[in-house]
């Protein structure tokens, strides 16, 4: 067993910059927006730009703001209660299984193949066995024939946290 | 008067289990964010665990995640680490202390031992 | 290689002015408060400076904090025997979601 190593008074634990303001959790929770306070009692606000939280929360601290990387650009800009939204640049996509970087997308299909999907920010060029319709997914072979694909239109975001 | 008091340390084999205990009284625990620190004999610090003042939200040192588990009791003002699967590395003496990233009252630190 | 470096240690004069540094990323010191712990020797640390220059009361004004961009310093004046201790400065880390103590810095009064 071990007993007491204390300090009295002490001032309020991470007191707030002048520019954040403070509230009062609600059931133990801040609101969007916002994080809790060491001690419980208080709610802090987010820096705009620097840092965001999205749903009630009693967080130490509100969630770092996504920084865009090269090769991609910001949908929108992060808020206090949103972060940052960042997609591919026109001609690259983010996959599921490699989200950490945009890749080049294809320029045509292989031999055989028919295109019926474009590049999207968020997927690669779709090809189809002229045949059997199956898709081809994977790496493209040496390519003897292509088909040539335009940019696919921005759509929706590749890079969404929050 | 605040003050925490640490009980559940000991000597313990590698692959084994412990729960340290840290009863507080003196301030509303309820509302405060309560943290783990530990200290390897003749080494500095090492920050292991925090837990909110609900429970609601936790965080954990990458060096026992998915090991130990921090919880609470805050119907008896007492702050847990549950710690699995121990290692040689985890021997340490373990401090509790008030707050989530600034530590202002500790406890006076239970020692666990790893060993085989 | 420590997240925080700070000298391993540190030494002065009884009276003197000593300062000990601590060094880190945009990822913690350079982003969040930093806080500084005196250890004395088979004790608990203890906090002495919070939010990079606020002294907990009891704490002597002998102590004070500075935070420059990723660099933080601790200076203590008037430097007395009892103020022989292992310092720490800690800072949370956005980067590892977490705390980090710098690995202390011995300070040996003379």
């Known amino acids: 067993e071990s007993a007491l190593i204390t300090q009295q008074d002490l001032a309020p634990q991470q007191r707030a910059a002048p520019q954040q303001k403070r509230s009062s959790p609600s059931e133990g929770l801040c609101p969007p927006g916002h994080h809790i306070s060491e001690d419980g009692r208080d709610c802090i606000s987010c820096k705009y730009g620097q840092d965001y939280s999205t749903h009630w929360n009693d967080l130490l601290f509100c969630l770092r703001c996504t920084r865009c990387d090269s090769g991609e650009v910001e949908l929108s800009p992060c808020t206090t209660t949103r972060n940052t939204v960042c997609q591919c640049e026109e001609g690259t996509f983010r996959e599921e299984d490699s989200p950490e970087m945009c890749r080049k997308c294809r320029t045509g299909c292989p031999r055989g193949m028919v295109k019926v999907g474009d590049c999207t920010p968020w997927s690669d060029i779709e090809c189809v066995h002229k045949e059997s319709g199956t898709k081809h997914s994977g790496e493209v072979p040496a390519v003897e024939e292509t088909v040539t694909s335009s940019p696919g239109t921005p759509a929706s975001p590749c890079s969404l946290s929050g | 008067q605040m003050q925490l008091v640490q009980s559940g340390g000991g000597l313990v084999k590698p692959g084994g289990s412990l729960r340290l205990s840290c009863a507080a009284s003196g301030f509303t625990f309820s509302d405060y964010y309560m943290s783990w620190i530990r200290q390897a004999p003749g080494k500095g610090l090492e920050w292991v665990s925090a837990?909110?003042?609900?429970?609601?939200?936790?965080y954990y040192a990458d060096s026992v995640k998915g090991r130990f588990t921090i919880s609470r009791d805050n119907s008896k003002n007492t702050l847990y680490l549950q710690m699995n699967s121990l290692r040689a590395e985890d021997t340490a003496v373990y401090y509790c202390a008030r707050g989530g990233s600034t530590f202002d009252i500790w406890g006076r630190g239970t020692m666990v031992t790893v060993s085989s | 290689q420590p997240v925080l470096t700070q000298p391993p240690s540190a030494s002065g004069t009884p009276g003197q002015r000593v300062t000990i540094s601590c060094s880190g990323s945009?990822?913690?010191?350079?982003?969040?408060?930093v806080n500084w712990y005196q250890q004395l020797p088979g004790t608990a640390p203890k906090l002495l400076i919070q939010?990079?220059?606020q002294r907990p009361s009891g704490v002597p004004d002998r102590f004070s904090g500075s935070k420059s961009g990723t660099s933080a310093s601790l200076a203590i004046s008037g430097l007395q025997s009892e103020d022989e201790a292992d310092y720490y400065c800690a800072a949370w880390d956005d980067s590892l979601t977490g705390y980090v103590f710098g690995p202390g810095t011995k300070l040996t009064v003379l």
């Open positions: 939010g990079n220059n």
């Open positions: 945009n990822s913690n010191i350079g982003s969040r408060p």
């Open positions: 837990i909110s003042g609900s429970g609601g939200s936790t």
